[in-house]
Interface confidence: low
C-alpha cells in the first residue's frame, strides 16, 4: 500500500477554494523528489495539473499552486475559483505519475443551494447550538410567534409562543420573546442533529400582515482531521467539545464497517481490549477538553475516530463530536523493538526504548501503565534519576546504546512486575512506545548471594555465577545509585581460553571491595552485556557494619542471606541449581587480605573473573 495519504473526499461549492494536504514519509529522497497533483482521465492516465517543479496546466493558470513542506513531510495543493467542471477523481503523489506513490482524492464541486431572497444561512456543526433570529413589526408584538420547518411543499410547526414543541425537538428547543421595545424573537436549538438540516420559516402574527423570515440551517458533520503517524509510534487525539459538555462523560470511538462507532475508551471506565496497555485518556481540563494517547500503533489501528460527550459514554445523535482520519505509515522511522519482554521471578529484564535520534539530549522516562478507569502512567524512572522509591536498587535507565535507543533494566522481578510499560521522552511525543513484561516459569541465570553485610575497613568479595551461555559476554559489577549504575573497575579477567571453553571453574565473576568504607553500603549489580547492549542482571544489597574483631573476613554463604531461589542447607553448604557445593570459599577470593593495613595495588573496588583453582567447586 502506498505510504502517501490525504483526504479521500473533498467537497466544495462553485466559486469557493479548497486546500488539499497530502502526507508522505519524510525520507531524504521523498523530501526532494517531485510532488504532483493530477486528474485521472477515462483512459486511466493521470494528467498533471500542478507540480512542485513549477508546472501549472492552462486550466489551473492563476488559480492553483502546490507548496512542499519537506520538514513536515507534507505538501499542499490550493485551488481557487472552483467550477462544477473541477469535480472528478485526482491523485496527489510523489515522483512519476504512474509509479504508485500516490493517494486517490475525489473532488466534488456543487452548486450552491437555491434559497428564497433574504434567507439567513446558519452553518453549525452537529451537536452544537444555533440561535435563529426572527424580526417582527410592532403590530405583531402581541401576536403568536412561531417557527416552522419546510419539508417539501408543506410547513411543519416546530415551536410557538403558545408552548407547543414538536416532539422531534423535545427538551432541546426554546423560543425567547424579549421585553418591550425589542422587535426580535429568537429560537435556540441545542444538540443539533443532522436531521435538523433544512429551511425554516419564522412567523409573527397571521393573515396578510404577518412577518416572515426564512432561515437555512446547515448542520455539518465535522470534517475529519487527517492524522499521519508512523507504525509502532504514538498518536494523540486532542478533543475540545466546549464548556456546555464539560461535566458530561467523554469517549473516543472508532467507526466500523457498519458505520457505527465502537468505543475505544471512555471516562466511564470502558476500554477496547485491542488497546490494552497502550492507551490513556488524559484528565479533562476545566473547559472540558481532554486528550487520548495511543502508543504502539499498528496498521489495524487505521480508520476514522470520533470523540464526543454523552452521559452513556458513547456516540449518540445530536451531541458534539470531533473527527480524525488516522493513517499508519508502514515505512516507519521508528525501529522495531520487542513489544513483549519475558523474565523469570527473581531475574531481570533489559528493555530497549527507541527515541528520536535527533533528540539525544532529551530527558528519557519509563512509566508503568495502569488500566484503572481512564488509565494512567506514573513515572518510575527518568534519565536524571529514579522517581519511585519502591524501585530502589532494582531499576535503572541507561543512555546506552544511544543514537536513538536507551535501555531500562529492572531486576529482582516478581509476578507483580508483569504489565505494560511505556518508553517516552520530553521531546517528540510520536516516539512513545509500549512494552509488555511477562513473568514466566524458570530460574534466573545469574546467581548472587542475598543481602550481604560487610565490615568497615575489611575486604569484601561478592561472587556472581553465570551459565556457559554467557561465556562470550562481557561481565561487570556496578554500584547502583538513583542516577544509574556506576561500573566498578575490572581486575584480571583470567585466561581467555577458559571462557572460550567454558571451563567449569571460570563461571563466576566476583566483586572485591578493599577496604570497605561507609560509602560502600548500597545495592550492587552483577550483569552481562555485549558491547552497549545489556543482558541479565542480579542485585545484592551490601550493608556495612562496624568492625567487631580484627582479622580476616571471608564472605561465606552462612554469613550472607540466601538469594530467594537458593536454599541454605547448613554453614558453608549451599544448593545452587541442585548441586551442593561444600566449600566455604565459593563466595570469596584468595585475594582477600588478612588485615586492613596494606592494600594490594591500591585498588579499593575491583571485579575479578579469574579461573583460579582456589575458587573451589562450581555449578553445572
Amino acid at each position: 500500500k502506498s505510504p502517501v495519504f490525504g483526504p479521500q473526499e473533498v467537497s466544495s461549492v462553485e466559486g469557493n477554494s479548497v486546500s488539499i494536504k497530502c502526507y508522505y514519509p519524510p525520507t531524504s529522497v521523498n523530501r526532494h523528489t517531485r510532488k504532483y497533483w493530477c486528474r485521472k482521465g477515462a483512459s486511466g492516465r493521470c494528467i498533471t495539473l500542478v507540480s512542485s517543479e513549477g508546472y501549472v496546466s492552462s486550466n489551473y493558470a492563476g488559480r492553483a499552486n502546490l507548496t512542499n513542506f519537506p520538514e513536515n513531510g507534507t505538501f499542499v495543493v490550493n485551488i481557487a475559483q472552483l467550477s462544477r467542471d473541477d469535480s472528478g477523481h485526482y491523485k496527489c503523489g510523489l515522483g512519476i505519475n504512474s509509479r504508485g506513490l500516490s493517494f486517490d482524492v475525489s473532488l466534488e464541486v456543487s452548486q450552491g443551494p437555491e434559497l428564497p431572497n433574504g434567507t439567513e444561512v446558519y452553518t453549525v456543526d452537529v451537536g452544537r447550538t444555533v440561535t435563529i433570529k426572527c424580526p417582527f413589526k410592532t403590530e405583531n408584538a402581541p401576536k403568536t410567534k412561531a417557527l416552522y420547518k419546510k419539508i417539501g411543499q408543506t410547513s411543519v410547526l416546530v415551536i410557538d409562543s403558545r408552548n407547543y414543541v414538536n416532539p422531534n425537538y423535545k427538551d432541546r428547543i426554546r423560543l425567547r420573546i424579549p421585553g418591550t421595545g425589542q422587535l426580535i424573537f429568537t429560537v435556540v436549538i441545542d444538540r443539533l442533529r443532522l436531521s435538523d438540516h433544512g429551511l425554516y420559516l419564522c412567523q409573527a402574527g397571521d393573515g396578510s400582515n404577518r412577518d416572515e423570515k426564512n432561515a437555512d440551517l446547515q448542520v455539518l458533520e465535522p470534517e475529519p482531521e487527517l492524522v499521519y503517524e508512523d507504525l509502532r509510534g504514538s498518536v494523540t487525539f486532542h478533543c475540545a467539545l466546549g464548556l456546555e459538555v464539560a461535566n458530561v462523560a467523554k469517549f473516543l470511538c472508532r467507526v466500523n464497517s457498519r458505520e457505527t462507532c465502537d468505543v475505544v475508551i471512555n471516562t466511564l471506565g470502558k476500554r477496547d481490549s485491542a488497546f490494552e496497555g497502550r492507551i490513556l485518556l488524559n484528565p479533562q481540563d476545566k473547559d472540558g477538553s481532554f486528550s487520548v494517547v495511543i502508543t504502539g500503533l499498528r496498521k489495524e489501528d487505521e480508520g476514522r475516530y470520533l470523540c464526543g460527550a454523552h452521559s452513556d459514554g458513547q456516540l449518540q445523535e445530536g451531541w458534539p463530536i470531533q473527527a480524525w482520519q488516522l493513517f499508519v505509515n508502514e515505512e516507519s522511522t521508528i525501529p522495531r523493538s520487542p513489544t513483549v519482554v519475558k523474565g523469570v521471578a527473581g531475574g531481570s529484564v533489559a528493555v530497549l526504548c527507541p527515541y528520536n535520534p535527533k533528540e539525544s539530549q532529551s530527558l528519557k522516562y519509563w512509566c508503568l501503565w495502569e488500566g484503572a478507569q481512564n488509565g494512567r502512567c506514573p513515572l518510575l524512572v527518568e534519565s536524571q534519576g529514579l522517581v519511585q522509591e519502591q524501585y530502589e536498587g532494582r531499576l535503572s535507565l541507561l543512555q546506552e546504546p544511544g543514537n536513538g535507543t536507551f535501555t531500562v533494566i529492572l531486576n529482582q522481578l516478581t509476578t507483580q512486575d508483569a504489565g505494560f510499560y511505556w518508553c517516552l521522552t520530553n521531546g517528540d511525543t510520536r516516539w512513545r512506545t509500549t512494552v509488555e513484561i511477562k513473568i514466566i516459569e524458570g530460574e534466573p541465570n545469574l546467581k548472587v548471594p542475598g543481602n550481604v553485610t560487610a565490615v568497615l575497613g575489611e575486604t569484601l568479595n561478592i561472587p556472581c555465577h553465570f551459565p556457559c551461555k554467557f561465556s562470550s559476554y562481557e561481565k561487570y559489577w556496578c554500584k547502583w545509585s538513583n542516577t544509574g549504575c556506576q561500573t566498578l573497575p575490572s581486575q584480571d579477567e583470567g585466561p581467555s581460553e577458559a571462557f572460550v571453553n567454558c571451563d567449569e571453574n571460570s563461571r563466576l565473576v566476583s566483586l572485591t571491595l578493599n577496604p570497605v568504607t561507609r560509602a560502600d553500603e548500597g545495592w550492587y549489580w552483577c550483569g552481562v552485556k555485549q558491547g552497549h547492549f545489556y543482558g541479565e542482571t542480579a542485585a545484592v544489597y551490601v550493608a556495612v557494619e562496624e568492625k567487631k574483631v580484627a582479622g580476616s573476613r571471608y564472605v561465606s554463604p552462612a554469613k550472607a542471606d540466601a538469594a530467594p531461589d537458593e536454599k541454605v542447607l547448613d554453614s558453608g553448604v549451599r544448593e545452587i541449581e541442585n548441586k551442593a557445593i561444600q566449600d566455604p570459599r565459593l563466595f570469596a577470593e584468595e585475594k582477600v587480605v588478612a588485615d586492613t593495613g596494606d592494600q594490594a595495588g591500591g585498588s579499593r573496588a575491583s571485579v575479578d573473573s579469574s579461573s583460579s583453582e582456589e575458587q573451589g567447586g562450581s555449578s553445572k
Epitope: E9, S11, S12, V13, E14, S106, E108, V109, S110, Q111, G112, P113, T123, K149, K150, I151, G152, L194, S195, D196, H197, G198, L199, D216, Q218, L220, E221, R258, E259, T260, E317
Partner: nanobody
C-alpha cells in the same frame, strides 16, 4: 452493510412519466441519517448526478438538465426514496442508480458511500 435496491425502470414514450423507487435495508444507522441521491449513466458516457435529497427531506437538489421535470422525495417510514420523472426525453435514457451518503454538504455535494445495482430507463421517440 447497506443494500440499496432500485425498481420502476422500463420503456416509455417521449413526454411520458415514470416513477423510480429505491429501497434501503441493512443499514446500521437509521435511514433518516443518510442523504440519498439519484445518478444516471447513459451508454458510453460517465455517470452523472441527477438529484439528491437531504436526510430529512427538507431540501432537494437537481441537475440543470432535469430541474422542473424531476422530483425526488423520501419516505422515512418505508426507508424509500422516489424519483418522479415527468416530460421524459430520449436524452433521459440511462441506467439510474440510487446512492446514499453518510455526510452531507449544502448544495449538490454528494460523497456517495453505497450504491444500488441500477435500473434501466429507455425513452423512445
Amino acid at each position: 452493510q447497506v443494500q440499496l435496491v432500485e425498481s420502476g425502470g422500463g420503456l416509455v414514450q417521449a413526454g411520458d412519466s415514470l416513477r423510480l423507487s429505491c429501497a434501503a435495508s441493512g443499514r446500521a444507522l437509521s435511514f433518516n441519517t443518510y442523504a440519498m441521491a439519484w445518478f444516471r449513466q447513459a451508454p458510453g458516457k460517465e455517470r452523472e448526478f441527477v438529484a439528491s435529497i437531504t436526510y430529512n427531506g427538507g431540501s432537494t437538489y437537481y441537475a440543470d438538465s432535469v430541474r422542473g421535470r424531476f422530483t425526488v422525495t423520501r419516505d422515512s417510514g418505508k426507508n424509500t426514496v422516489t424519483l418522479r420523472m415527468n416530460s421524459l426525453k430520449p436524452d433521459d435514457t440511462a441506467v439510474y442508480y440510487c446512492a446514499s451518503a453518510q455526510y452531507w454538504r449544502s448544495g449538490t455535494s454528494f460523497p456517495a458511500n453505497y450504491w444500488g445495482q441500477g435500473t434501466l430507463v429507455t425513452v423512445s421517440s
